[in-house]
């Protein structure tokens, strides 16, 4: 058993049929010695008396808010949560496996630039009685500071018969140099509590590996005289690291109709303009990627050909 | 320590081309190592990230773009002295700071070159003959060093009398390649910045 936060404790349980469970001793936070009774949650049934209460925690029915009283007055609370371990593996029931970039990916993180700010998000089908707490650091043995905000519900989607909820959190490394060469990864730890179930999820990454620039901005077309060719130009996104001559991007320019299966014109360039062939009912799209370290491409920025 | 804006005229910077070749060569070599050594811990997640130039050179700090010198987190107090002549400095406007930056890059390349050559000598003794260093990568390191053209003492190639542990050597190769790729990215950024300034 360990303390998650003040008066909230996590009991780690090997979860299998007829498991013996864990013996837990609760101590009432009071100078009083006599006349103390214990109850669980809203029940008035007295579970025991005395300054300490010893319980055998085997299942979720044994978890919950234990309260010690004296003469009708509440002295203190202890909330017991369960963390299940099945076949030596901690349970991951609360969050959905996003399977990208690999299986067992529960947390996904992205950074728009090298400033040390990044966003992580996760998915769940649970809609109520759910809380998250996020901590982060650079390295684990001698951790350096990363400050994370509160996790918030950022999107709701319908997937078949199920509703899916996306939560996200923003974090900022306390003293980040955009030009630095990372040797210690960022560690992100998410504590998830659903009713009386506790789970924790972690992710470890270098900012350079989670870079995904914003799409290029200000796409403009200029038809070329006596030609089907069009000059398309654009600018670096505002959120990208500066100076741009140091943090350079490369671009992919594509002309395509509405269907992905349609024919297309595609060209890669390090410049902020390109010449392509425009077709009726097609769109010109441009996306960006770090020129020197190939992490993710940005989303497409698009303009119609006409 | 930072790069000044007064740098060679655009298109007159001979090291840009070599630095692009360097990044390409080390990236290809790393990809090859990851494929060939698939049963060794050779991915970014599996290896320890070591920097053989740590406390010996200070390329990131010496080559910091002017715009980032206002960022407290970028200013590291490490002091290293460098030789200050070189043929990439194609303009009279070239400052002492830029010479410092380029000589730091030169020292990085020299240290990695020695490590890679020592390692290749060991890998050539491996009866499995599983992996060797790409000669193109070694040639590209040499080309960039020649383009930088700094005079500096020759670092003797480390020779080891004991029987090499090939497993450890291959893991060390992965660690070196990952670190060198990161440094090659920095070098490419620096050259691009200097070329544009």
């Amino acid at each position: 058993i360990w303390e998650l936060k003040k008066d909230v404790y996590v009991v780690e349980l090997d979860w299998y049929p007829d498991a013996p469970g864990e013996m837990v001793v609760l101590t009432c936070d009071t100078p009083e010695e006599d006349g103390i009774t214990w109850t669980l949650d809203q029940s008035s049934e007295v579970l025991g008396s005395g300054k300490t209460l010893t319980i055998q925690v085997k299942e979720f029915g044994d978890a919950g808010q234990y309260t010690c009283h004296k003469g009708g007055e509440v002295l203190s609370h202890s909330l017991l949560l369960l963390h299940k371990k099945e076949d030596g593996i901690w349970s991951t029931d609360i969050l959905k496996d996003q399977k990208e970039p690999k299986n067992k990916t529960f947390l996904r993180c992205e950074a728009k630039n090298y400033s040390g700010r990044f966003t992580c998000w996760w998915l769940t089908t649970i809609s109520t009685d759910l809380t998250f707490s996020v901590k982060s650091s650079r390295g684990s043995s001698d951790p350096q500071g990363v400050t994370c905000g509160a996790a918030t519900l950022s999107a709701e989607r319908v997937r078949g018969d199920n509703k899916e909820y996306e939560y996200s959190v923003e974090c900022q490394e306390d003293s980040a140099c955009p030009a630095a060469e990372e040797s210690l990864p960022i560690e992100v730890m998410v504590d998830a509590v659903h009713k009386l179930k506790y789970e924790n999820y972690t992710s470890s990454f270098f900012i350079r590996d989670i870079i995904k620039p914003d799409p290029p901005k200000n796409l403009q077309l200029k038809p070329l005289k006596n030609s089907r060719q069009v000059e398309v130009s654009w600018e670096y996104p505002d959120t990208w690291s500066t100076p741009h001559s140091y943090f350079s991007l490369t671009f992919c320019v594509q002309v395509q109709g509405k269907s992905k299966r349609e024919k297309k014109d595609r060209v890669f360039t390090d410049k902020t303009s390109a010449t392509v062939i425009c077709r009726k009912n097609a769109s010109i799209s441009v996306r960006a990627q770090d020129r020197y370290y190939s992490s993710s491409w940005s989303e497409w920025a698009s303009v119609p050909c006409s | 320590r930072n790069l000044p804006v007064a740098t060679p005229d655009p298109g007159m910077f001979p090291c840009l081309h070599h630095s692009q070749n360097l990044l390409r060569a080390v990236s290809n070599m790393l990809q090859k190592a990851r494929q060939t050594l698939e049963f060794y811990p050779c991915t970014s997640e599996e290896i320890d990230h070591e920097d053989i130039t740590k406390d010996k050179t200070s390329t990131v700090e010496a080559c910091l773009p002017l715009e980032l010198t206002k960022n407290e987190s970028c200013l590291n107090s490490r002091e290293t002295s460098f030789i200050t002549n070189g043929s990439c400095l194609a303009s009279r406007k070239t400052s002492f700071m830029m010479a410092l930056c380029l000589s730091s890059i030169y020292e990085d390349l020299k240290m990695y070159q020695v490590e890679f050559k020592t390692m290749n000598a060991k890998l050539l003794m491996d009866p499995k003959r599983q992996i060797f260093l790409d000669q193109n990568m070694l040639a590209v390191i040499d080309e960039l060093m020649q383009a930088l053209n700094f005079n500096s003492e020759t670092v003797p190639q480390k020779s080891s009398l004991e029987e090499p542990d090939f497993y450890k050597t291959k893991i060390k190769l992965c660690i070196l390649l990952h670190a060198f790729r990161i440094r090659a990215v920095t070098i490419d950024r620096v050259m691009s910045y200097l070329n544009a300034s």
Partner: antibody, heavy 118, light 107 residues
Framework: QVQLVQSGAEVKKPGSSVKVSCKAS????????LHWVRQAPGQGQEWMGW????????EYAPKFQGRVTITADESTSTAYMELSSLRSEDTAVYYC???????????WGQGTLVTVSS | DIVMTQSPLSLPVTPGEPASISCRAS??????LHWYQQKPGQAPRQLIA???QSISGVPSRFSGSGSGTDFTLTISSLQPEDFATYYC?????????FGQGTKVEIK
Amino acid sequence: QVQLVQSGAEVKKPGSSVKVSCKASGGTFSDYYLHWVRQAPGQGQEWMGWIDPENGDTEYAPKFQGRVTITADESTSTAYMELSSLRSEDTAVYYCARNKELRYFDVWGQGTLVTVSS
Amino acid sequence: DIVMTQSPLSLPVTPGEPASISCRASQSISINLHWYQQKPGQAPRQLIAFASQSISGVPSRFSGSGSGTDFTLTISSLQPEDFATYYCQQSNSFPLTFGQGTKVEIK
């Protein structure tokens, strides 16, 4: 299986014209750009131009502009390349090639040898 | 027009050995570079798209690398069926242009 089948070899007199055909089978004809590329004996390839069979749009290499005409007949899934004012240096194998991507080629025809000789 | 220069023009290789062919562009073409193989009397066959993207059905011993002006096609271990002429082609701008070809022959 996508195939491009070209017409047979031709022998032409200098100053005349030649029209080579390229019939596509497998896949929808108008879903692909169609290019013509030639290869003179012992030489590398030379790109001549492309057509979008869907709308008849064409683009020609400046070297051949005014001398080459690329057309397409959607009803027969056939593209044509006509080269006029032939000279001896036009002796080459002419290939048609196609792709959904405009600027490179994933399937090629077997080639048509055009000999220009007096 | 962008001029593509291949080297060497002829490359004698022992079967089972690796081979590398270089292609250089007269100006930067990013990764807009494609490789083809051609055997005598046959049409070219696509090997690599956009400098390094492998094509389905092409053996994994063929790989491409490069960007900007310098590109390389590598055959990790030459098989008897790989003796042919190899061409690079740029797609950065029209007119599309090819290298003059590299003939890989048995040593």
